[in-house]
């Protein structure tokens, strides 16, 4: 903290400009009015500001508005805006996405900070759900932002927001949450014709059910491996061997190189050898002609 | 050790352009302003400008403003001034320097690099 | 901008002397800083905020003022003195150099 000390003669700032670069931080406190670096902030981002100085000009702020800055100053923030704390930021009421963006901007090319992650939360909850030019504008920003958000708070993304999900932002995504995509995605593609809803849907089926694959099977969409082995396991595990044969099409040779790994591992065992053996590939593990194969899971659920 | 390490001289023909590196080393090179100054023959120093490597936001003197132009390479951690429209006058030692903690002058200095301007 | 006007420009010292050389100012600045510089090599920072001494810098070195008057001062001339001093204000833009003044070895 700089200690108060009187301004010298003729050094009161009478604008924020560039001469203040060359004041002590003594200075910078003792000489600049906070309301005029308010009004001014704008001009904060042009000049060399050292780190020091910076959180000089911050303390200024904090001491004029200590409930929190308003919008119109926000706006203007620039690079103090990487002075601030998460506890800062949760003070602030932003509701304008122009606000967001000018502030996403100045953090552009670095990962996401607990800063950043603390003024979208802000940003979001104001709103009330993540709409489409919102989705838009994080997504931008930060590709794998969906990704970071909790199944919980993705239900709350409306399916008219998931025209703006591009296939890089849900690189990250778990099953739990492209469980809750999914249907969202489903929803809003649901007018599409087969082969552009194929598409459009095909970086969402790691949510999708054994239903839903077994009707895509019957559209010839050859689905390529990385998507087949994204999708869940207990959903492909019910599929026939001619129903992931019409899915993979020609990609099905595909599934040699992948035979140890999951979903097809298991898929494999699930399915009789013979069957196995129409497609050619060498597949083995099926299970072997004359076993007789119980499913305990139906037996329970009649039970 | 701290230390700023400028590229070698230059020769250039009059009206062409210069660009002059300052590589640092030893410190956190986006935590202090770099400034650059020109010291003709034997004469006195000339504050060129100043810029933040870790915003690229510059502050020029008025009298070399529009021909000097001032970057930074972040990821090699080096400042550069391009000079332009090159007259006999700029003929000179630019060094760069760094800006002290607080406005504490000038703390470190590079060896300098020699800008001759001849046809 | 300031003018800073240094002043002897040239002026030599035997060992052991007291030597002292002043930098004015046009108008008022809050601190000086003064450089060292010998033949052939870059300055080096050598009292700066008016008083402090730089790393390295010997003890009879000191630096003093205020407003537009300050003054750089040697309680004892050592050989390795012998150099270009320059001051320079930091407290408006653009920053200013005095023109040195010279210390030679008497």
């Known amino acids: 903290e700089v200690e108060k000390t009187a301004c010298p003669s003729g050094k009161k700032a009478r604008e924020i400009d560039e001469s203040l670069i060359f004041y002590k931080k003594w200075e910078l406190e003792a000489c600049v009015d906070a309301a005029l670096l308010a009004t001014q902030m704008d001009r904060v981002n042009a000049i060399p500001f050292t780190y020091e100085q910076l959180d000089v000009l911050k303390h200024k702020l904090d001491e004029l508005y200590p409930q929190g800055y308003p919008e119109s100053v926000i706006q203007h923030l620039g690079y103090l805006f990487l002075k601030m704390s998460p506890e800062d930021i949760r003070k602030w009421n932003v509701t304008s996405l122009e606000t967001l963006k000018a502030l996403l901007e100045v953090n552009k090319g670095h990962e996401m900070s607990p800063q950043v992650a603390t003024l979208i939360d802000r940003f979001v909850k104001g709103r009330g759900q993540l709409d489409k030019d919102t989705l838009d504008t994080l997504t931008a920003f930060y590709p794998g932002y969906l990704c970071s958000l909790s199944p919980e708070e993705l239900s709350s993304v409306p399916p008219s927001s998931i025209w703006a999900v591009r296939p890089q932002d849900l690189d990250t995504c778990d099953p739990r949450q492209l469980d809750v995509l999914y249907p969202k995605a489903r929803l809003a593609f649901q007018n599409m014709n087969g082969s552009e809803y194929f598409v459009k849907i095909q970086s969402f089926l790691g949510g999708a059910p054994t239903e839903d694959l077994k009707a895509l099977s019957q559209q010839n969409v050859s689905m390529d491996l990385a998507t087949f082995m994204k999708l869940r396991t207990d959903a492909v595990l019910p599929l026939t061997v001619a129903e992931v044969q019409k899915l993979l099409g020609p990609h099905v040779e595909g599934l040699k190189a992948e035979e140890r790994h999951r979903p097809v591992r298991d898929w494999i065992l699930r399915q009789r050898q013979d069957d196995l053996d129409t497609l050619g590939l060498g597949l083995q593990g099926g299970i072997p002609n004359g076993y007789l194969v119980l499913d305990l899971s139906m037996q329970e659920a009649l039970s | 050790e701290f230390q700023l390490q400028q590229s070698g001289p230059e020769l250039v023909k009059p009206g062409a352009s210069v660009k002059i590196s300052c590589k640092a080393s030893g410190y956190s090179f986006t935590d202090y302003n770099m400034n650059w100054v020109k010291q003709s023959n034997g004469k006195s120093l000339e504050w060129i400008g100043i810029i933040n490597p870790n915003y690229g936001t510059t502050s020029y003197n008025q009298k070399f403003k529009g021909r000097a132009t001032l970057t930074v390479d972040q990821s090699s951690s080096t400042a550069y001034v391009q000079l332009n429209s090159l007259t006999s006058e700029d003929s000179a030692v630019y060094y760069c320097?760094?800006?002290?903690?607080?406005?504490?002058?000038?703390?470190?200095w590079g060896q300098g690099t020699s800008v001759t301007v001849s046809s | 901008q300031i003018v800073l006007t240094q002043s002897p420009a040239i002026m030599s010292a035997s060992p052991g002397e007291k030597v002292t050389m002043t930098c004015s100012a046009s108008?008022?600045?809050?601190?000086m800083h003064w450089y060292q510089q010998k033949s052939g090599t870059s300055p080096k920072r050598w009292i700066y905020d008016t008083s402090k001494l730089a790393s390295g810098v010997p003890a009879r070195f000191s630096g003093s003022g205020s407003g537009t008057s300050y003054s750089l001062t040697i309680s004892s001339m050592e050989a390795e003195d012998a150099a270009t001093y320059y001051c320079q204000q930091w407290s408006s833009n653009p920053p200013t150099f005095g023109a040195g003044t010279k210390l030679e070895l008497k």
């Open positions: 320097a760094r800006g002290g903690y607080d406005n504490e002058a000038m703390d470190y």
């Open positions: 108008s008022s600045v809050s601190y």
